[in-house]
Structures are given as structure tokens and as C-alpha cells.
Amino acid sequence: MMTGTIETTGNISAEKGGSIILQCHLSSTTAQVTQVNWEQQDQLLAICNADLGWHISPSFKDRVAPGPGLGLTLQSLTVNDTGEYFCIYHTYPDGTYTGRIFLEVLESSVAEHGARFQIP
């Protein structure tokens, strides 16, 4: 029986050009975490395996850094990074737990506020 739950940072936003930490935490289970996969809309970003450590997908290696912990740091954000991210926890003996994070990358806080608070 799977008793665990995944806690995530939920919906988050960050500025274009900046960085963000994607973080998930598995709780309420004594299952052993054997591997965590980080995915973005049917694309593999990175894997952290208990035995093998981290593997970053070649196409993301310049912009993705492992950690902190089992989390993932995205750097040099672009608006194309907006979307859903998934942390997939492979555990023994429970099986697989999945968490979801939605990231919105904003052009900039100045542009964001400028659109709403124009000086007459």
C-alpha cells in the first residue's frame, strides 16, 4: 500500500534570465528512494539515482544543475521554460510517486508592473 505523499513548491514564477529551484519532498512513507526523474513535458531533464548519482540530459547540461538535495536548479531561464515539471520518485517497495510543479517565466518584474501601472 502506498502511503507516501509528494510535497512540491506548487505554482512558481521567476524572471527571464534568472534561476529557480525545483523541489519535491516525499513524506509519510518509509520506502527507500532509489531514483528521482525530473521531466518537463515528455522530456527528460535529469535523473538522480541512489547508486549512480546524477545524470543531466546533454541538451540541458548548460542550464540545469543538480540539487540542492534531490531538487533541480534551472538557470538562464527563458519564456520557453514556462510549463509543467514533474518529479518522479521511484521507491522500494512502494513504487512510483509523482509530483507536479508549474513554472511561469516572466519577461521581467518591470515589464510586468509597467503593463499595469502606467504613469499618465
Epitope: E39, D42, Q43, L44, N49, D51, L52, S57, S59, Y92
Partner: antibody
Framework: EVQLLESGGGLVQPGGSLRLSCAAS????????MHWVRQAPGKGLEWVAA????????SYADSVKGRFTISRDNSKNTLYLQMNSLRAEDTAVYYC???????????WGQGTLVTVSS | DIQMTQSPSSLSASVGDRVTITCRAS??????LNWYQQKPGKAPKLLIY???SLQSGVPSRFSGSGSGTDFTLTISSLQPEDFATYYC?????????FGGGTKVEIK
């Protein structure tokens, strides 16, 4: 350098048994899942069986379930495939493969030929 | 079981040609798709993993794309050493399954 070396193949009669071995070197064997894949003469690739890094779990193709057993000895850096009740359709080259992160087969052995015939 | 359908089953091409091989899964497999090259009498060799990641040491003329059910292996400029059989393989769920293979022959 990663190396996988299969052995134990040969000619066996239908209903007979064989045990294949795959000797691993050049990497930390105990950290990797390992798989067996076979290829009948002139045919494509067929996955046979898999075992995780600590031998805690294994899985099999339906075509070999109940007849083949995958195992490993991490102290000897060796993977095994015990094949019982062999049939003519088991005739193939058997490859062992290393599977990092459970997703892709990055290194393969050279294969060992199993021929089941009377 | 997830069925993997490769097309074409064979093709003839010339050195320098752009070659495209497709693989279709019977259900969505996300990015869990790998491509292998096999030459006669030799073991398969990993080319592309996780749909689009180039395996270390593999020439950049090989590329992979796709997700879900439809995937493509592209060789941008075919070289003499690329004449071989290519297989796709899903690792989304067991039993792992391979496509039937695509034999790339010299025209």
C-alpha cells in the same frame, strides 16, 4: 573500459538446460541494473529478462517466464541466466547489457549463441 | 504489451543522403525511447537515449526527436560506416520491446 563477456552457450537438446554467464569489468557492477536480450538467427532483438542492482527485483518476457531465471553475484561481478525446459524457439544469440538509470542499454556484450536442436 | 512499429523496414540510400527512420509506439511512452545501431555479427550499439539525447562518442550527424507515440531517428549525412540495421526500443514498461528494425543499405 567497460567490458561484458558472455559465456555458457552451446548446443542443447529440447527440454534441456543451460546457464549463461556475463562477466563484467571496468565499472561498479553492483550499481547497475542488468538485462538479457536475445536475437534469433536473421531476426530482430527480443528482451528476455532484467534484474535490478541489488537483485531485489527481476522481470521476464512472457515467452520465458517460469523457465528462465536471471540472477547476479555482485561479489563476482557476474550476471547469470539459468535456462530450463529449452525449446527450439529459444535458439538465439544471447546478449547481456548494462542499464544505467533503468532507461537505456549503454553497453552490450558480444553475445553467446544458444542452439536448441535434437 | 507496448508494440513498437518501425518504418521503413529497409531503405537504400547513398553516402551524403539525409536518412529518416520512424518508430511508433502503440501507446504513449513519454520520452522512454532509445535507438540502437547493429552491424552484422556485432552487438547493438546505443546511439540515442531518452528520445533525443546523443550517447557519448556517437557522431553528431545522428539525432533523435519525438515524444509520446511518434519518434524519429535522423542521420543528417549518411557515411559509409552507417550502413547497418537500426532498432528503436521502449523502456517505459516491461516487457521492454523493440521495433522490427530498419536495414539501411547502399544504393
Amino acid at each position: 573500459e567497460v567490458q561484458l563477456l558472455e559465456s555458457g552457450g552451446g548446443l542443447v537438446q529440447p527440454g534441456g538446460s543451460l546457464r549463461l554467464s556475463c562477466a563484467a569489468s571496468g565499472f561498479t557492477f553492483s550499481s547497475y541494473s542488468m538485462h538479457w536480450v536475445r536475437q534469433a538467427p536473421g531476426k530482430g532483438l527480443e528482451w528476455v529478462a532484467a534484474i535490478n542492482s541489488n537483485a531485489g527485483s527481476s522481470s521476464y518476457a512472457d515467452s520465458v517466464k517460469g523457465r528462465f531465471t536471471i540472477s547476479r553475484d555482485n561479489s563476482k561481478n557476474t550476471l547469470y541466466l539459468q535456462m530450463n525446459s529449452l525449446r527450439a524457439e529459444d535458439t538465439a544469440v544471447y546478449y547481456c547489457a548494462r542499464v544505467p538509470y533503468g532507461v537505456w542499454m549503454d553497453y552490450w556484450g558480444q553475445g553467446t549463441l544458444v542452439t536448441v536442436s535434437s | 504489451d507496448i508494440q513498437m512499429t518501425q518504418s521503413p523496414s529497409s531503405l537504400s540510400a547513398s553516402v551524403g543522403d539525409r536518412v529518416t527512420i520512424t518508430c511508433r509506439a502503440s501507446q504513449s511512452i513519454s520520452y522512454y525511447l532509445n535507438w540502437y545501431q547493429q552491424k552484422p555479427g556485432k552487438a547493438p550499439k546505443l546511439l540515442i537515449y531518452a528520445a533525443s539525447s546523443l550517447q557519448s562518442g556517437v557522431p553528431s550527424r545522428f539525432s533523435g526527436s519525438g515524444s509520446g507515440t511518434d519518434f524519429t531517428l535522423t542521420i543528417s549525412s549518411l557515411q559509409p560506416e552507417d550502413f547497418a540495421t537500426y532498432y528503436c526500443q521502449q523502456s517505459y514498461s516491461t516487457p521492454l520491446t523493440f521495433g522490427g528494425g530498419t536495414k539501411v543499405e547502399i544504393k
